[in-house]
């Protein structure tokens, strides 16, 4: 037996973080996002659950909805109708998948100071929203869409085709929710509330994933989800638009699919209303390197939607897939014809382009060896966007304003110099026409949310500065965080290193690599966090490193598309390269190096452990993908193509974790998975375990009954992190 090694932070009255701190969420931070209801007014839910109205200009504030009203129905969320006459209150939240949930909705009448009783909403509802004007309600119940002209009116049923697990109207099926839309809804009101666009997903021919949910009963339940894995039959999508003024006169009208898309399997990717009678739809070929943006107009004479060929804009990638993780959405100008959009420039960096007529004639608005990330708002004279340009750090986000009214347009960084040390990673929330906006800074210092004037960018007030958190952290020994880059051959890899308090370069420390590494992801970000790895550095004296290898985002397509059609190769290689570089730094104990990851990170950590390099003593994979054939079609095929002989079956087969089972012989491997994982099915870990058993390789495993991909129930999460901590401490010979 090795002597146990105990890390003791030296002579300091401050205490180290404990695992309990992390599990209890003792050091969680707050952000403040105004719920904008006009150009200068917003709502916010106070600490004591009152819904408070604020007017920035008059400095007026009052309770619009009392906590007693919220409490009377156990409401956890709310939504004010645009005419400000009603509020929906959401309760009985019941999570389904990543974004979707069902809930009970109550309508409170602000005019009359009471709940609306006539024609109550059914329960549970899958999605509900107000029209952008007035107080019409659209909602989805049992996979069908309903409309109410006023909350107290009888509902009008718009669709009748809805059927559980077969046809979904106005809400996405599993794969569209997770991999394409990233929302719980698939319906969109026109700006004036006249039209309602929605998608119908037909999953009738999709294979079913079935797994047991054990619950408390004598017999387990079986959960059935239409889930297309790589190469399987996909949902059939159709987009319809209904006139909500006269829904009974003319039924929903189907929007035509562009010919070049409809000729083979395709996806709907997003819908953007341009004006009250103009809509923009985005489509994607199943082989996701061709995207078509189609602008359609309402023809009153035909009572139909027309999408002329000259209003089709094609975006194609020759080096990988179209877009980043998703294809970007357009930000239309006031003229309702031209738009701004982020896509790759000739050098392979994602930048803002202005499209007036054709994509070929697009005017590039931003350029450089960095990337534009998101367009927040386009107004008459300004365009607000975020990028990682400042000082060349890919893991930062600053907000910029381009004055498009000027010729040539001038660019200003709104956030770069505000709180330079504390704030390097921002997002923003704008009022309707950007008269005011809130900045939310996520770090690297303590998060802070501030309110700003949209004309001058002057700070008006601090909305949330996490003073309590600052005070409670005063007596905590936090680790030191460094973000740097390392070079290997012609490649540059950014990494984040979390160093124990009183770190001493002349000493040797155990190293834990935390990896995700999925295409278009980013782990090395300048954000504040107090989590499990912070604890491991603070209390257990472990050096933590996160490395963004090839395939990760915001550093150009050459770096991003390097993994195209060959997942599981360079992501792993680059983690190994980084580990070797860290060893060269001289403070890493080569005998005590571990790697861990979750989901895609579980896949990479498994492959790294099975790389046969002898670099790692041990590692953990939580809910890992083990074969791309087991994962969702939209995701797997985006990066790997199809698992067919004439496409990419060979790499599908040799990129599995199972294919490397023999190589786990000389490492300590902890495999963890939730049995009710709807996303990365338990099947993935079951197959790894089977292969390891067949190869007579010893390993450790833990399953979490009835837990999904997040293993997030309080008890399970506590057990998980405690278990992983014991495993790591044992691996690193750290005493309990």
């Amino acid at each position: 037996l090795r002597p146990s090694r105990v890390y003791k932070p030296e002579g300091n009255t401050k205490r180290a973080l404990t695992l309990k701190d992390i599990l209890n969420g003792t050091f969680s931070y707050k952000t403040y996002f105004p719920n904008w209801i006009s150009e200068q007014e917003y709502l916010h839910q106070s600490e004591d659950d009152n819904i408070v109205f604020y007017n920035i200009e008059t400095r007026e504030s009052y309770i619009i909805l009392s906590n007693s009203t919220m409490k009377s129905v156990n409401a956890t969320d709310y939504g004010l109708s645009p005419d400000r006459q009603f509020v929906y209150l959401e309760s009985d939240y019941s999570k389904l998948w990543r974004y979707s949930y069902t809930a009970t909705y109550y309508i409170y009448d602000l005019q009359n100071g009471e709940f609306v009783r006539g024609y109550e909403l059914p329960r549970p509802i899958q999605y509900l929203c107000w029209s952008p004007v007035g107080s019409k309600l659209a909602y989805v119940y049992q996979n069908n869409i309903y409309l109410k002209q006023r909350p107290g009116d009888p509902p009008f049923q718009i669709t009748y085709t809805g059927r559980e697990n077969r046809i979904f109207n106005g809400i996405p099926d599993w794969v569209y929710e997770e991999e394409m839309l990233a929302t719980k809804y698939a319906l969109w009101w026109s700006p004036d509330g006249k039209f309602l666009a929605y998608v119908e997903f037909n999953d009738s021919d999709i294979p079913i994933i079935a797994y047991s949910y054990y619950g408390d009963g004598q017999y387990p339940r079986t959960i059935n989800i239409p889930y297309p894995k790589a190469g399987a039959k996909n949902p059939v999508v159709r987009v319809f638009i209904v006139d909500t003024t006269y829904p009974h006169h003319v039924g929903p009208m189907e929007v035509p699919v562009p010919e070049m898309i409809a000729s083979s399997d395709y996806y709907f990717s997003w819908l953007t209303w341009v004006s009250s009678e103009r809509v923009c739809l985005q489509w994607l070929k199943r082989v996701q390197n061709v995207s078509v943006l189609s602008i359609c107009d309402f023809r009153e004479d035909w009572h139909a939607w027309e999408c002329p060929k000259n209003q089709e804009h094609v975006e194609e990638s020759r080096t990988g897939w179209a877009g980043g993780f998703f294809v970007s959405t357009p930000a239309f100008s006031q003229d309702a014809t031209s738009y701004y959009k982020i896509f790759s420039d000739k050098d392979g960096y994602k930048h803002i382009h202005y499209i007036k007529d054709t994509v070929e004639n697009a005017i590039q608005i931003t350029s450089g060896k960095w990337e534009a990330i998101y367009i927040f708002r386009v107004t008459q004279d300004s365009l607000f966007y975020s990028s990682n340009e400042f000082e060349g750090y890919p893991g930062r986000r600053n907000i910029y304003r381009i004055s498009i009214g000027n010729s040539p347009p001038s660019k200003k960084c709104v956030t770069c110099h505000l709180r330079k040390e504390r704030c390097q990673y921002y997002t923003a929330s704008f009022s309707y026409k950007a008269k005011y906006y809130a900045l939310v800074c996520y770090g690297p210092g303590l998060p802070i949310s501030t309110l700003h004037d949209g004309r001058t960018d002057q700070e008006i007030q601090v909305l949330e500065e996490n003073k309590e958190l600052e005070n409670s952290l005063r007596n905590i020994q936090l680790p030191k965080v460094e973000i740097k880059k390392l070079k290997d051959g012609g490649l540059t890899f950014w990494y984040k290193m979390i160093l124990p308090p009183q770190f001493d370069r002349s000493k040797k420390y155990p190293l834990l690599i935390q990896v995700y590494g999925g295409p278009c992801s980013q782990s090395v970000k300048s954000v504040f966090a107090v989590n499990w790895i912070t604890y491991l550095a603070s209390k257990e004296g472990i050096v933590i490193a996160l490395v963004d290898g090839r395939g990760t985002a915001f550093q150009g397509d050459k770096f991003l598309h390097a993994v195209y059609r060959k997942l599981g190769v360079y992501e792993v290689e680059d983690q190994l390269t980084a580990v070797r570089k860290f060893i060269e730094m001289g403070f890493i104990d080569e005998e005590r190096i571990a790697i861990w990851g979750w989901s895609y990170g579980g896949y990479v950590s498994s492959l790294a452990l099975a790389s046969g390099t002898g670099l790692f003593k041990c590692g953990i994979a939580v809910a890992p993908v083990s074969s791309w054939e087991y994962y969702a079609s939209i995701y797997s095929e985006r990066f790997m193509g199809l698992p067919t002989k004439d496409d990419n079956l060979e790499h599908y087969k040799n990129s599995t974790v199972m294919a490397r089972a023999e190589y786990f012989r000389n490492v300590d491997y902890l495999l963890i998975h939730g049995t009710a994982d709807d996303n990365v099915h338990f099947q993935n870990s079951a197959q790894i375990a089977k292969a390891l058993v067949n190869a007579q390789v010893d390993f450790q495993a833990m399953w979490y009954s009835d837990q999904n991909h997040g293993i997030s129930s309080g008890r399970s999460q506590n057990h998980l992190y405690t278990h992983m901590t014991h495993f790591l401490k044992q691996c690193f010979s750290l005493s309990d």
């Epitope: 009203t69 009359n112 100071g113 009471e114 109550e120």
Partner: antibody, heavy 124, light 113 residues
Framework: QVQLVQSGAEVKKPGASVKVSCKAS????????IHWVRQAPGQRLEWIGG????????NYNQKFKGRVTITVDTSASTAYMELSSLRSEDTAVYYC?????????????????WGQGTLVTVSS | DIVMTQSPDSLAVSLGERATINCKSS????????????LAWYQQKPGQPPKLLIF???TRESGVPDRFSGSGSGTDFTLTISRLEPEDFAVYYC?????????FGQGTKVEIK
């Protein structure tokens, strides 16, 4: 004690407008909505509309929409009802009444106190 | 709109006798989630504003004598005055406050026989 005191009787010509006030006292003004109800000779009571003093949002009976305007002055604890384009059939006694705001889901209240009434006569 | 219909239109009753007034609504006033009926009864004397007697169909407003009682559920309701006193001769209105617009019955006049 609770009181709703209305302005005095009015005689108006057809096509004119009338504005009736209702001053509240003896209770917290913002805890109740104010409603307007009229009673034409020999007719049933007819609800015209109401207003929530907390946000000034009015709610009108569709029958009167476009002709009626209900407002509130919270600082004076007073509500107003203005009816325009008067016709002879608008001749009635106009009452204001209070109705408690229902903060809780199980609540819902009747109109428990009424003003003394204002006679509006429309005659050429 | 919910239509409220009272019967009879008028009622002649002797002092000390029982008076029963009926009220029917065109749709149910029973709220399933709290099992309450959103119906009120008012008394109106000449030259005076209406006075609240009963709410929730059967709950007496404070200060209202116990000879007044309300009953019924859903769409059919009754106001009963068990022993008429001289001051009870008036017009009685039912009113629904289940949904907007608020609506009243046409009234029932209780006269001395």
């Amino acid at each position: 004690q609770v009181q709703l005191v209305q302005s005095g009787a009015e005689v108006k010509k057809p096509g004119a407008s009338v504005k009736v006030s209702c001053k509240a006292s003896g209770y917290t003004f913002t805890e109740y909505t104010i409603h307007w109800v009229r009673q034409a000779p020999g007719q049933r009571l007819e609800w015209i509309g109401g207003i929530n003093p907390n946000n000034g949002i009015p709610n009108y009976n569709q029958k009167f929409k476009g002709r009626v305007t209900i407002t509130v002055d919270t600082s004076a604890s007073t509500a107003y009802m203005e009816l325009s384009s008067l016709r002879s059939e608008d001749t009635a006694v106009y009452y204001c009444a209070r109705r408690r705001i229902a903060y809780g889901y199980d609540e819902g209240h009747a109109m428990d106190y009424w003003g003394q009434g204002t006679l509006v006569t429309v005659s050429s | 709109d919910i239509v409220m219909t009272q019967s009879p239109d008028s009622l002649a009753v002797s002092l000390g006798e029982r008076a029963t007034i009926n009220c029917k609504s065109s749709q149910s006033l029973l709220y399933s989630r709290n099992q309450k009926n959103y119906l009120a009864w008012y008394q109106q004397k000449p030259g005076q504003p209406p006075k609240l007697l009963i709410f929730w169909a059967s709950t007496r407003e404070s200060g209202v004598p116990d000879r007044f009682s309300g009953s019924g559920s859903g769409t059919d309701f009754t106001l009963t005055i068990s022993r008429l006193e001289p001051e009870d001769f008036a017009v009685y209105y039912c009113q629904q406050y289940y949904s907007y617009p608020l609506t009243f019955g046409q009234g029932t006049k209780v006269e001395i026989k």
